[in-house]
């Protein structure tokens, strides 16, 4: 048994750190496979990650962890039985990927305006909670050639967009994703879509 | 009440061995770690030795590297320090003291908040 | 190793005057903000050492407020308000950041 692809891991800042990898031919992850870690700090203890299937080759795992500091570091063993297969080692700070923003939710019964408004997915304890920024994918299932980006580099997790800048009569759909600056993250995944309808309508002078 | 209480203190000859235990009481003795802690004669105090609640991770003084093993029975909620190889400098109260919650990914310290009123080891010929 | 200064050794004090002793370590004791890894003992006459204060500023369970720590990375401070005369007996500081703990060379509270 061979690792092809090393264990590669980003962490959430926040309690789960995800490392994926692949191996040199199918493999039952759960099955074959455990990955140990263990924080480099004073009497702490080894901890198991029983690692999940991802694809025919690849194995991911989430391990738990308490929330993240700048000094943490981990070491990382991949265990198949009694063989150890690779050993590295793993400093959450250093490859942060933040949680998806959550509840995106569209307001279009403000005048002239469609009102995009999401939840940081960060406690206000938590380092990364006023550090995030963010990017609203707007696109239109109706108009393929509709897509964009807006970035919204303030702290709060709204968006305004004139009604006026999009078609009336048609569907478009909106997701958010995260990044924090000072932690030189990358970008979380998207949020889920959500859909809505545009009946605004110009007032008749303007048409 | 949380409660340790050392034994198997002694008076020993230089080049022998001792072993001293450690028994804990009112707490979840598996999920802290501990630690030995000496006091020669007159002399402040000096750490000797700690374990991780599961008992994976030891750590040891440079003095008595070599010559001591601290273990631990979780079953008998119970701690003891093997003391081999003995010399005259090894005389001092020893203590046991419950040390960090270990079973976190990142140990919880709360200080060494409870200590054993101690046993005397006596190395001498 | 981690090297713990302690300052005085010796400490006369007046009963109800407050009292202070310092430390220092010879490396960061910080490892995340609020979590300075040194606390403070107080060893009366054939007794155990008791935990006065744990990661530099936290009181233990039971302690009198008149007893505070404080102080970040290498130097930290115990202060007792006003000085009983209970409080007799040596002060130790321990740095609890990695193995081997070290302890400072203890400090001597008599009351004048």
């Known amino acids: 048994m061979k690792v092809l692809q090393e264990p590669a891991c980003v962490s959430d800042y926040m309690s789960i750190s995800t490392c994926e990898w692949k191996m040199g031919g199918p493999t039952n992850c759960s099955a074959e496979l455990r990955l140990l870690y263990q924080l480099v700090f004073q009497s702490s203890e080894t901890h198991t990650c029983v690692p999940e299937n991802n694809g025919g080759v690849g194995c991911v795992c989430h391990l738990l962890m308490d929330d993240v500091v700048s000094m943490d570091n981990y070491t990382l063993d991949l265990w198949a039985g009694q063989q150890l297969l690779w050993k590295g080692s793993f400093k959450p700070s250093e490859h942060v990927k933040p949680r998806a923003p959550g509840n995106l939710t569209v307001h279009t019964n403000v005048s002239d305006t469609v009102l995009l408004t999401w939840s940081n997915p960060y406690p206000p304890d938590n380092y990364l909670y006023n550090d995030l920024t963010y990017a609203v994918n707007i696109w239109s299932e109706n108009d393929p050639a509709y897509s964009r980006i807006h970035n919204v580099t303030y702290l709060k997790p709204t968006l305004r967009i004139p009604a006026s800048t999009l078609k009336s009569g048609i569907s478009y759909r909106a997701r958010v994703r995260a990044w924090a600056q000072h932690y030189n993250t990358t970008w979380s995944e998207w949020s889920p879509s959500t859909k809505w309808y545009n009946s605004y309508r110009e007032p008749f002078e303007q048409r | 009440e949380v409660q340790l209480v050392e034994s198997g203190g002694g008076l020993e000859q230089p080049g022998g061995s001792l072993r001293l235990s450690c028994a804990g009481s009112?707490?979840?003795?598996?999920?802290?770690?501990m630690t030995w802690v000496r006091q020669a004669p007159g002399k402040g105090l000096e750490w000797v030795s700690s374990i991780s609640g599961s008992g994976s991770s030891t750590y040891y003084a440079d003095s008595v590297k070599g010559r001591f093993t601290i273990s631990r029975d979780n079953s008998k909620n119970t701690l003891y320090l093997q003391m081999n190889s003995l010399r005259a400098e090894d005389t001092a109260v020893y203590y046991c003291?419950?040390?960090?919650?270990?079973?976190?990914?990142?140990?919880?310290?709360?200080?060494?908040?409870?200590w054993g009123q101690g046993t005397t080891v006596t190395v001498s010929s | 190793d981690i090297v713990m200064t302690q300052s005085p050794l010796s400490l006369p004090v007046t009963p109800g005057e407050p009292a202070s002793i310092s430390c220092t370590a010879s490396?960061?004791?910080?490892?995340?903000?609020?979590?300075?890894?040194v606390d403070w003992y107080l060893q009366k006459s054939g007794q155990s050492p008791q935990l006065l204060i744990y990661?530099?500023?936290k009181r233990a369970s039971g302690v009198p407020d008149r007893f505070s720590g404080s102080g970040s990375g290498t130097d930290f401070t115990l202060k007792i308000s006003r000085v009983e005369a209970e409080d007799v007996g040596f002060y130790y500081c321990?740095?609890?950041?990695?193995?081997?703990?070290?302890f400072g060379q203890g400090t001597k509270l008599e009351i004048k």
């Open positions: 321990m740095q609890a950041y990695n193995s081997p703990y070290t």
């Open positions: 003291a419950k040390d960090r919650l270990s079973v976190t990914v990142r140990p919880r310290y709360y200080g060494l908040d409870v």
């Open positions: 009112g707490f979840t003795f598996r999920d802290f770690a």
């Open positions: 990661l530099g500023s």
């Open positions: 490396q960061s004791l910080l490892y995340s903000i609020g979590y300075n890894y």
